[in-house]
C-alpha cells in the first residue's frame, strides 16, 4: 500500500507515477449502516441481494436515506471527519439510514489509480440503490449522497449510473486533479441528480488546486472565496500545532468543506448565507448581497433546492470555527473630495454599533482604487449578529501603492514640512445587510463637518431606512 | 466474547527476524482494524502500525517503517507482525489491539502482549 | 507528531480515596482521547473513550473529562484491583500517541 505523504508536494509526484500492478483481487465496496453515534460501535454490513441485514440493521424504508463517501486515503482507516458527519447527520435526522460506503480498497492506492476506480464505486453504489427500489416504500427522491473530495465525483458517477433520480447529491469540495475541465459524465455535474450542490474550499488558480476550482453542480457555493480559510493558515496552524506543516494547512482547507455542512446540521439555528456572484472579486467589493430572484441561499444542508439555476456561483465569508455563520454588510461610500492626497491610498476603517453588540474595527478591503467624486463599494462583516445597526464611526489612514511612492511622499513631506493636511469628504455612507436585506443610509453627524484627516474620526448616524434620498421617490426595502 | 490471542516469548540474536502472530476471535474479523503497539522496558506504548483485515490495506508510524511488516489470514483471523534487522532497541513487549473503523475509535480488545528479547 | 504528556509518573493512594490523572495533549485533539489501565502483569484494558465515555464492563467510579488539551481521569471510592499504571492516548491524528503513563500505587 502507499506510503503517507503530504496530500500537495507529492500528489503532484504522484500523478506521473506508472500504474500499480494488483496481485490480487480484492474485495471492493462495502455498505456500512451506522447504527450509533459511537465512533466503536462497528455498525452493520448490508449486501446486495440480501434483505435479512435490512431487517438486522433496522434500514428504515420511509426514512431519507444519506450515503457518505470518501475520497482517496493515505492511511486506510477513516477519519475523524467522517465521524462528525454521520453524529451530526443522526442528530438532525433522527430516523434516517446513514450509510458509510467503505471503498477503502480502491480509495487505499495511487492517486491515479483511485481515479480510475471512482466510475467502478459510483456503478456500486447505483446497483445497490437499484436494488433498494425494488423494495416496498423505498424512494430514490429520498437518498442523499455526500461525497467528499474523490467521494463527490463517485457520487455523480452513482448518480448517472443508477436507474432514475436521486433527490440530492452534496459534493464537500471535490477533488481537481484529472477531473478538472473534465467531460460532465466523468466528473460530477449538474445531471447527476435533481439537486446538486456543492462546497469549494481548497480551490487554487496558482500550484495544484485540490479541490476542483470549476462550477460542477447547480448551486457551487465559494466560502472565503474557495480558496484562503481563516484559521487553516500557516500561522494558525503552526500556532496549534507542535510541529504544524504545510499538509495540515491542505487537510484544513480541503477539510473545511465537511465541517461546514456538519456546521449546517447541527447549528440549524446559526445558518451561513451565500450570495451569487459572477466572481469572487466582485463578492469582495460587496456588490453581491442581493437575496431578490433566488440569488441568495442558505449553505450546507440547509440549502434550498434551486433546479432552474445551473453552475450558479455562491460567496460568503465565514468564522475560523464553528459556527461559521458572519453577518455581511455592502458599505457604499461616496467620497466627494480629496485634498492633498499627492499618491496615497486611502485605508478605511470602519466601527459599528449596534442595538445587540458593537463590533470590532474593521478593515475596508480595497479591490479597485479608491475614486473620488464617486461611490465606492466595500464587503464588511462581524462575528457577532449586531442587532439593528445605529451609528458608524469612520477613520482612515495612508497607505502608499508602493515604496517608490512612498519615497516620493516622504522626500514631499520633507521639503515642505508645513504641508497642509491631507483630507477626505465623506457626507454619509448606505449600509446594507445581508442577512436581514434591509437597506439604511447614515449621515454625518455633523453635516458642517464631513471631511476627515487621516488618524481622525468621523460619526454617522442612521438617518433614514432604505437609500433614497429626500428629492427622489419613497424609499423601498427588499425582502429576502 | 472478543479474544486477541498472541504467540509466545521470542529470544533471538541481533539481526534475526521474527514474526509475531495475533489470532482474533469472538468477532467479525473484517469488521476491525488490528493495530500493533511496543512497549519497551518500563516506557509508555508506542504505535507501530496498523492493517485494515478486509483488503489487506496497511499503514505505518514512519519510525517503523523500515522495521515492521504487518499481514493477515483472513481464513484464520490471525493478523501477523514482522520485525526484521532485529537490535537490542527491539527488545520489548509487543500488544495487538483490535480498533474500529475510525481514527477516534478507541482500542478496545487488546492482546496479551508477545515479549521479544534480542540478545546476542 | 503530537505529544501527549502525563506529568504525574507515580501517585500514592489508599483505599476510598478520590483519585484524578491528567494528561496534556501538544495541541487541541477535539476529544479523541482514550484512557487505558495496564495491569503488572501486562494485561492492558480500555477504560474511557472519547473523552468520557465508559467502556462496557468498565465500573462507574471511573469516570473521563476535559477539553481542547487538557484531559483528566477520576477515579472515586478506589478499590484494590485499581492499583496499576494508567495510559492516554490521542485518536486525533495519525500517528496514534499515548501519554507516558502514571503509575498508581497503594499508599
Known amino acids: 500500500s502507499p506510503t503517507p505523504f503530504g496530500p500537495e508536494g507529492q500528489l503532484a509526484d504522484e500523478l506521473h507515477k506508472p500504474k500499480a500492478i494488483q496481485t490480487e483481487v480484492k474485495p471492493s465496496v462495502r455498505f456500512n449502516l451506522r447504527t450509533s453515534k459511537d465512533p466503536e460501535h462497528e455498525g452493520c454490513y448490508l449486501s446486495l441481494g440480501h434483505s435479512q441485514p435490512l431487517e438486522d440493521c433496522g434500514f428504515n424504508m420511509t426514512a431519507k436515506t444519506f450515503f457518505i463517501i470518501h475520497g482517496w486515503t493515505m492511511s486506510g482507516i477513516f477519519e475523524n471527519w467522517l465521524h462528525k458527519l454521520v453524529s451530526a447527520l443522526h442528530t438532525r435526522e433522527k430516523d434516517a439510514n446513514v450509510v458509510v460506503v467503505d471503498w477503502l480498497p480502491l480509495a487505499h492506492q495511487l492517486y491515479t489509480d483511485a481515479v480510475n476506480n471512482t466510475r467502478v464505486v459510483g456503478h456500486s453504489i447505483a446497483r445497490m440503490l437499484d436494488w433498494l427500489q425494488e423494495k416496498d416504500d423505498f424512494s430514490l427522491g429520498n437518498v442523499h449522497l455526500i461525497g467528499y473530495s474523490l467521494g463527490a465525483h463517485v457520487a455523480g458517477y452513482a448518480g448517472n449510473f443508477v436507474k432514475g433520480t436521486v433527490g440530492r447529491i452534496t459534493g464537500l469540495d471535490p477533488a481537481g486533479p484529472m477531473f478538472e475541465g473534465a467531460d460532465i459524465h466523468k466528473r460530477l455535474s449538474p445531471d447527476d441528480a435533481d439537486f446538486v450542490d456543492v462546497l469549494h474550499t481548497y480551490t487554487r488558480s496558482f500550484g495544484l488546486s485540490i479541490g476542483i476550482q470549476m462550477p460542477v453542480g447547480h448551486i457551487d457555493i465559494y466560502p472565503n472565496g474557495g480558496d484562503f480559510q481563516p484559521g487553516c493558515g500557516l500561522n494558525d496552524v503552526l500556532g496549534s500545532m507542535a510541529y504544524g506543516t504545510i499538509t495540515e494547512v491542505v487537510k484544513c482547507e480541503h477539510e473545511r468543506a465537511v465541517h461546514l455542512f456538519v456546521d449546517s446540521l447541527v447549528n440549524q439555528d446559526k445558518p451561513s448565507f451565500a450570495f451569487q456572484c459572477t466572481d469572487s472579486n466582485r463578492f469582495k467589493k460587496g456588490i453581491c448581497l442581493s437575496c431578490r430572484k433566488n440569488r441568495c441561499n442558505s449553505i450546507g444542508y440547509n440549502a434550498k433546492k434551486m433546479r432552474n439555476k445551473r453552475n450558479s456561483k455562491m460567496y460568503l465569508k465565514t468564522r475560523a470555527g464553528m459556527p461559521f455563520r458572519v453577518y455581511h454588510y455592502q458599505m457604499k461610500i461616496h467620497v466627494f473630495s480629496y485634498k492633498n492626497m499627492g499618491e496615497i491610498e486611502p485605508t478605511f476603517y470602519v466601527t459599528l454599533y449596534g442595538t445587540n453588540a458593537d463590533s470590532q474595527t474593521l478593515p475596508l478591503e480595497i479591490v479597485e482604487r479608491i475614486e473620488q467624486n464617486a461611490t465606492n463599494t466595500f464587503l464588511v462583516y462581524t462575528e457577532e449578529d449586531l442587532g439593528d445597526l445605529l451609528k458608524i464611526q469612520l477613520t482612515w489612514e495612508g497607505a502608499s501603492q508602493s515604496w517608490y511612492n512612498l519615497w516620493k511622499e516622504l522626500r514631499s513631506y520633507l521639503s515642505q514640512p508645513h504641508n497642509p493636511g491631507r483630507e477626505l469628504n465623506i457626507r454619509r455612507i448606505r449600509v446594507k445587510s445581508g442577512e436581514t436585506q434591509r437597506k439604511l443610509t447614515f449621515c454625518a453627524e455633523d453635516p458642517e463637518n464631513t471631511s476627515i484627516s487621516p488618524g481622525r474620526e468621523l460619526w454617522f448616524r442612521k438617518c433614514r431606512d432604505g437609500w433614497r434620498m429626500k428629492n427622489e421617490t419613497s424609499p423601498t426595502v427588499e425582502l429576502p | 466474547e472478543v479474544q486477541l490471542q498472541q504467540s509466545g516469548p521470542e529470544l533471538l540474536k541481533p539481526g534475526a527476524s521474527v514474526k509475531i502472530s495475533c489470532k482474533a476471535s469472538?468477532?467479525?474479523?473484517?469488521?476491525?482494524?488490528i493495530h500493533w503497539v511496543k512497549q519497551s522496558h518500563g516506557k509508555s506504548l508506542e504505535w507501530i502500525g496498523h492493517?485494515?483485515?478486509?483488503?489487506?490495506?496497511?499503514n505505518n508510524n514512519e519510525k517503523f517503517k523500515d522495521k515492521a511488516t504487518l499481514t493477515v489470514d483472513k481464513s484464520s483471523s490471525t493478523a501477523y507482525m514482522e520485525l526484521r534487522s532485529l537490535t537490542s532497541e527491539d527488545s520489548a513487549i509487543y500488544y495487538c489491539a483490535r480498533k474500529g473503523i475510525y481514527y477516534s475509535s478507541p482500542f478496545d480488545y487488546w492482546g496479551q502482549g508477545t515479549t521479544l528479547t534480542v540478545s546476542s | 507528531d503530537i505529544q501527549m504528556t502525563q506529568t504525574t509518573s507515580s501517585l500514592s493512594a489508599s483505599l476510598g480515596d478520590r483519585v484524578t490523572i491528567s494528561c496534556r495533549a501538544s495541541?487541541?485533539?477535539?476529544?479523541?482521547l482514550n484512557w487505558y489501565q495496564q495491569k503488572p502483569d501486562g494485561t492492558v484494558k480500555l477504560l474511557i473513550s472519547y473523552t468520557s465515555k465508559l467502556h462496557s464492563g468498565v465500573p462507574s467510579r471511573f469516570s473521563g473529562s476535559g477539553s481542547g488539551t487538557d484531559y483528566s481521569l477520576t477515579i472515586s471510592n478506589l478499590e484494590r484491583e485499581d492499583f496499576a499504571t494508567y495510559f492516554c492516548?490521542?485518536?486525533?491524528?495519525?500517528?496514534?500517541?499515548f501519554g507516558s503513563g502514571t503509575n498508581l500505587e497503594i499508599k
Open positions: 492516548q490521542q485518536g486525533n491524528t495519525l500517528p496514534f500517541t
Open positions: 495541541q487541541d485533539i477535539n476529544n479523541y
Open positions: 469472538g468477532y467479525t474479523f473484517t469488521d476491525n482494524t
Open positions: 492493517i485494515n483485515p478486509y483488503y489487506g490495506g496497511t
